[in-house]
Interface confidence: low
């Protein structure tokens, strides 16, 4: 049994996750994550599914966060800014956006790095999943510590 | 006894810290902090050591965060971006990077201000210390509220 | 009775809020918020007052955060950067700044989007209110998820 599981007692175990970005050849705008490096996965009440979403088993309030570092150039990118979105998919419901951040591309060449941080408190239902979307995954920086995603149950 | 200490009972006291940036003449890349202004230090289970690192006495999951505001100019700075790193030093272990953020320098003159926010959930061992590194401490803004560092135990 | 209220027992109910930005015709620099969309208001121990401030009934340590996305242009704006401030008003005290972030305006036209995230742990007294100030509210982005404000009691 995971040591975190017992810290608050069986009725109210600690639930937290922190996962690390993973470069992907997929063309999807959903970022990919892995349990690697200095990751956190407190117990089986939160899981990383298909490398793309954190799924919780218990209803409650969660602080959910994501950090995305990216490198882009104004001339080489579309006119639209780089947008990172924290999204929610609850069982039997449509996906919805919880949080977004937008940064205009840099004029630096070949590209300019910028970091985005998202975070907020949301109620999640049992089986709810959260994931991170970006406008251009190829611009995301995957060096140590630059891009990560996590949550903690209050 | 600090009033925070007892809020969750002796077995599970509240542990939290929030410290304020301090300008330093030191040439080190490690930022300096102080218990001044509207700071938080819940009890002696977390301490600020040597003005540079937050050290915890109890093992567990912590949400750790840092905010750094800096002012830099592309022409006056190195080509490398401004990088802020949240780092961990555990007893008997090498230092490691937990989180990083990178922002390309501004073209604004004399310098352009930017703010970085880092935050994530990590397991800390007893005696573990966390600290913040930046590429150029002379560019950091120390005005009220601009640069701070903290943690809370889940 | 709200389901969150009971999760920690009557003595220590969960206290958390997450509110969504609201465009305002007011000329004040204080941002306006609403309980709309995917908002959180755990119980009556935290309330949104006058659409502008989160007010707490219980003393304790709170993690308070705000995210502001804005769109500005260097030529059309004042020389001063865009600054977002998280402020505290406690009963019988002057207002004070808890956290600030500053971003120099973009050279992109008509305007360049940028996102700011603020967050930290602070002690609040009963009746204390927190609110968010910005240098130019007309530049704030109110699209889904871009600008939000919240807190959670440790």
């Amino acid at each position: 049994e995971n040591s975190f599981e017992m810290q608050k007692g069986d009725q109210n175990p600690q639930i937290a996750a922190h996962v690390i970005s993973e470069a992907s050849s997929k063309t999807t705008s959903v970022l990919q994550w892995a349990e690697k490096g200095y990751y956190t996965m407190s117990n089986n009440l939160v899981t990383l599914e298909n490398g793309k979403q954190l799924t919780v088993k218990r209803q409650g309030l969660y602080y959910i966060y994501a950090q995305v570092t990216f490198c882009s150039n104004r001339e080489a990118s579309s006119q639209a800014p780089f947008i990172a979105s924290l999204c929610l998919k609850s069982p039997g419901r449509f996906e919805r956006i919880l949080l977004r951040a937008a940064n205009t591309h840099s004029s630096a060449k070949p590209c300019g790095q910028q970091s985005i941080h998202l975070g907020g408190v949301f109620e999640l239902q049992p089986g709810a999943s959260v994931f991170v979307n970006v406008t251009d995954p190829s611009q995301v920086s995957h060096g140590t510590g630059f891009t990560s995603f996590g949550l903690l149950k209050l | 006894e600090n009033s925070f200490e007892m809020q969750k009972g002796d077995q599970n006291p509240q542990i939290a810290a929030h410290v304020i940036s301090e300008a330093s003449s030191k040439t080190t890349s490690v930022l300096q902090w102080a218990e001044k202004g509207y700071y938080t230090m819940s009890n002696n289970l977390v301490t600020l050591e040597n003005g540079k690192q937050l050290t915890v006495k109890r093992q567990g999951l912590y949400y750790i965060y840092a905010q750094v505001t800096f002012c830099s100019n592309r022409e006056a700075s190195s080509q490398a971006p401004f990088i802020a790193s949240l780092c961990l030093k555990s007893p008997g272990r090498f230092e490691r990077i937990l989180l990083r953020a990178a922002n390309t320098h501004s073209s604004a003159k004399p310098c352009g201000q930017q703010s970085i926010h880092l935050g994530g959930v990590f397991e800390l061992q007893p005696g573990a210390s966390v600290f913040v590194n930046v590429t150029d401490p002379s560019q950091v803004s120390h005005g009220t509220g601009f640069t701070s560092f903290g943690l809370l135990k889940l | 009775e709200n389901s969150f209220e009971m999760q920690k027992g009557d003595q220590n109910p969960q206290i958390a809020a997450h509110v969504i930005s609201e465009a305002s015709s007011k000329t004040t620099s204080v941002l306006q918020w609403a309980e709309k969309g995917y908002y959180t208001m755990s119980n009556n121990l935290v309330t949104l007052e006058n659409g502008k401030q989160l007010t707490v009934k219980r003393q304790g340590l709170y993690y308070i955060y705000a995210q502001v996305t804005f769109c500005s242009n260097r030529e059309a704006s004042s020389q001063a950067p865009f600054i977002a401030s998280l402020c505290l008003k406690s009963p019988g005290r002057f207002e004070r700044i808890l956290l600030r972030a500053a971003n120099t305006h973009s050279s992109a036209k008509p305007c360049g989007q940028q996102s700011i995230h603020l967050g930290g742990v602070f002690e609040l007294q009963p009746g204390a209110s927190v609110f968010v100030n910005v240098t130019d509210p007309s530049q704030v982005s109110h699209g889904t998820g871009f600008t939000s404000f919240g807190l959670l009691k440790l």
Epitope: - | I20, K36, Y38, T144 | G92, R93, I97
Partner: nanobody, 128 residues
Framework: EVQLVESGGGLVQPGGSLRLSCAAS????????IGWFRQAPGKEREGVSC???????SYTDSVKGRFTISRDNAKNTVYLQMNSLKPEDTAVYYC??????????????????????WGQGTLVTVSS
């Protein structure tokens, strides 16, 4: 021992200026808030201005734009520059602090009972 000593008061005509000083000893002023209060004859003591440990300043509505608070950490002294003085500014002016309150002592209060240490006061009279 914590000590505060005010100076700079006096008689001045309406529209004139004065600069009050509050010299602190026994503690490092820069880590704590210093508040200026005033008490007019027959009235309660009221908060006028404050400078917090990190340098943020606050003013009561009636003096905004006329009074400026500042601090010289090297001299361990806080100043209150009073311009465009009015007869209703006539009062004994006190500075106050409370380094015993830890981090709460670094923040500004409007209520005098929140401060543990007071100077002896300096009289400001605005009259023609």
């Amino acid at each position: 021992e914590v000590q505060l000593v005010e100076s700079g008061g006096g008689l001045v005509q309406p529209g004139g200026s004065l600069r009050l000083s509050c010299a602190a000893s026994g503690f490092t002023l820069e880590y704590y808030a210093i508040g200026w209060f005033r008490q007019a004859p027959g009235k309660e003591r009221e908060g006028v201005s404050c400078i917090s440990s990190e340098g943020s300043t606050s003013y009561t509505d009636s003096v905004k734009g006329r009074f400026t608070i500042s601090r010289d950490n090297a001299k361990n002294t806080v100043y209150l520059q009073m311009n465009s003085l009015k007869p209703e500014d006539t009062a004994v002016y006190y500075c106050a602090t409370d380094p015993d309150r830890g981090f709460l002592g670094s923040s500004c209060d409007t209520q005098s009972h929140q401060y543990g240490y007071w100077g002896q006061g300096t009289l400001v009279t605005v009259s023609s």
